[in-house]
Amino acid sequence: ADPGKKFKNSTYSRSSVDVLYTFANCSGLDLIFGLNALLRTADLQWNSSNAQLLLDYCSSKGYNISWELGNEPNSFLKKADIFINGSQLGEDFIQLHKLLRKSTFKNAKLYGPDVGQPRRKTAKMLKSFLKAGGEVIDSVTWHHYYLNGRTATKEDFLNPDVLDIFISSVQKVFQVVESTRPGKKVWLGETSSAYGGGAPLLSDTFAAGFMWLDKLGLSARMGIEVVMRQVFFGAGNYHLVDENFDPLPDYWLSLLFKKLVGTKVLMASVQGSKRRKLRVYLHCTNTDNPRYKEGDLTLYAINLHNVTKYLRLPYPFSNKQVDKYLLRPLGPHGLLSKSVQLNGLTLKMVDDQTLPPLMEKPLRPGSSLGLPAFSYSFFVIRNAKVAACI
Amino acid sequence: ADPGQDVVDLDFFTQEPLHLVSPSFLSVTIDANLATDPRFLILLGSPKLRTLARGLSPAYLRFGGTKTDFLIFDPKKE
């Protein structure tokens, strides 16, 4: 059946914009605002008049915002019975770019086209979009979900075959970008475990962390510059923070990632053939962390085996002191727990204004790094003196 | 039990970075649909939520999703 016109238009007010901007600003986050791309003239050109009203308002308030235009335009046909091809969308972005240059937003960033996964037609749309409008965007954005939230199972969340599917999607996007706009930065503009709001009783549990950490690791290793997690807060099951403002396991995992993982991406691999259930990633350590210094390494690892694995570091790192940050689920629900322990201590906020300290467990130099079955962990190799990290 | 069979040797490549990601590499979204929630202003005003968000700074906050293309700005709306 033709599903067209499933969605009703809604309006939002100046105060909605204010609260969104204030939230981002007070939290130290840079706001990227998605503009409606389905406002069209009779000949299917983008009608920019509503965007202009918003730009004028944000300008008057001095808001520093970046912009997108449209969300998953490859699905406009399904959502609204309108087909906009990539070239037309590219022209629309050029029009928006001109609006931004005319306003106080002349240095505002523009990202797009926020296409879905790179299937045949979507990849074609991305390619023609980039040919037409790729010059005016600052990064190429696309979306990825592993599964359908309605049908996903716990087994899917722990299946390396499912995790590996992401690799070919990233490769396809890079193929399109490199053939049209070589060197243009690629971002995951929206991503999570399962679409449709996530998988109930899975996307908000410890089990979701395997997908999240693996996606972060693979994205960094494959050259994706930014990964935007759907969602920080809101409806569904894939939120980092629930409706009671309580942080879920993926929030704590994200917080640890932020504190420990730096921007320089290195390479770690497992020797031998049994690599797919034991997944390892390596970066320079985040030097904003006062405990660590330039030259230190952060290894993060995922164990999908049903037995503990002991990781042995290569020379010359095997005798360095290592700080371990092991995440494990808390309570009788096991992998389906919504609470998490860091090195055996339950993670929870001290009070509404205070995050807990993320306490490391120093390991004896030379000891192998134990990673229990179905767990994930960060290991900071101290005093590693890696030249590439200095 | 002898852990020997479950010892795994790692290889590292540390000569040079493969890539450089953004300091905002790990970023987050708020779904545009949240703007239609009558409690939108209250929810995002929560000091606890802001504390949690601050923990992930620096990051981008992308406001978008399916509802993006079904939202219209009304500057006259109260």
């Epitope: 059946a1 033709d2 490859n74 046909l77 399904k78 019975d81 309108i82 087909f83 091809n85 996964q117 299937r119 045949r120 037609k121 979507t122 074609k124 599964l147 359908n148 309605r150 049908t151 075959d161 590996d164 599917i165 070919s168 999607s169 | -």
Partner: antibody
Framework: EVQLVESGGGLVQPGGSLRLSCAAS????????MSWVRQAPGKGLEWVAS????????YYVDSVKGRFTISRDNAKNSLYLQMNSLRAEDTAMYYC??????????WGQGTLVTVSS | AIQLTQSPSSLSASVGDRVTITCRAS??????LAWYQQKPGKAPKLLIY???SLESGVPSRFSGSGSGTDFTLTISSLQPEDFATYYC?????????FGQGTRLEIK
């Protein structure tokens, strides 16, 4: 209501030609990829060809390449399949279908092509 | 070309039964798989797209799952109108291919 109606099938000798048509209504024809799919008597489904919205891109199964041509006339809301050098193994019910990124959501009732001497 | 192998080729079942049909791809196709139902003398009807999304208007007793190379179509409680032939189809890459079909008949 979305409708796809095929026509042009019939009996033809090996080596002969036929042109199938598909009349579309109830949707914006020019917005959709369109396809031809066939089914030999008592057999399974086989994709034959697909065409981009504006007709600029066409794809074919190997067994019909060089013999069949898919085309469309968006002004007439019509899809065509020109079949030349027909063989006995081309005998089948031919369906036109509306193609999305995830499959074919609407199909015609089919038109039967019989290639026999 | 990507080959799809359905199993079983035919299946006898009774009204109310739970039935599962599997489809295996010769290489990974992400979730780019659809399932169709075809009754004699009729055109196929789309049931499931994207491996697990239910096409609108299709009864919820039909469900799909899988990703990569292994996929399943499940009918949770067979109804008389469900006796038909079922096909899986991959649309990950050209040429688009179908499984050979699974005939579901009344026991």
């Amino acid at each position: 209501e979305v409708q796809l109606v095929e026509s042009g099938g019939g009996l033809v000798q090996p080596g002969g030609s036929l042109r199938l048509s598909c009349a579309a209504s109830g949707f914006t024809f020019s917005s959709y990829w369109m396809s031809w799919v066939r089914q030999a008597p008592g057999k399974g489904l086989e994709w034959v060809a697909s065409i981009y919205q504006d007709g600029s891109e066409k794809y074919y199964v190997d067994s019909v390449k060089g013999r069949f041509t898919i085309s469309r006339d968006n002004a007439k809301n019509s899809l065509y399949l020109q079949m030349n050098s027909l063989r006995a193994e081309d005998t089948a019910m031919y369906y036109c279908a509306r193609e999305l990124d995830w499959g074919w959501d609407y199909w015609g009732q089919g038109t039967l092509v019989t290639v026999s001497s | 070309a990507i080959q799809l192998t359905q199993s079983p080729s035919s299946l006898s079942a009774s009204v109310g039964d739970r039935v599962t049909i599997t489809c295996r791809a010769s290489q990974g196709i992400s979730s780019a798989l659809a399932w169709y139902q075809q009754k004699p003398g009729k055109a196929p009807k789309l049931l499931i797209y994207d491996a697990s999304s239910l096409e609108s208007g299709v009864p919820s007793r039909f469900s799909g799952s899988g990703s990569g190379t292994d996929f399943t179509l499940t009918i949770s409680s067979l109804q008389p109108e469900d006796f038909a032939t079922y096909y899986c189809q991959q649309f990950n890459s050209y040429p688009i291919t179908f499984g050979q079909g699974t005939r579901l008949e009344i026991k």
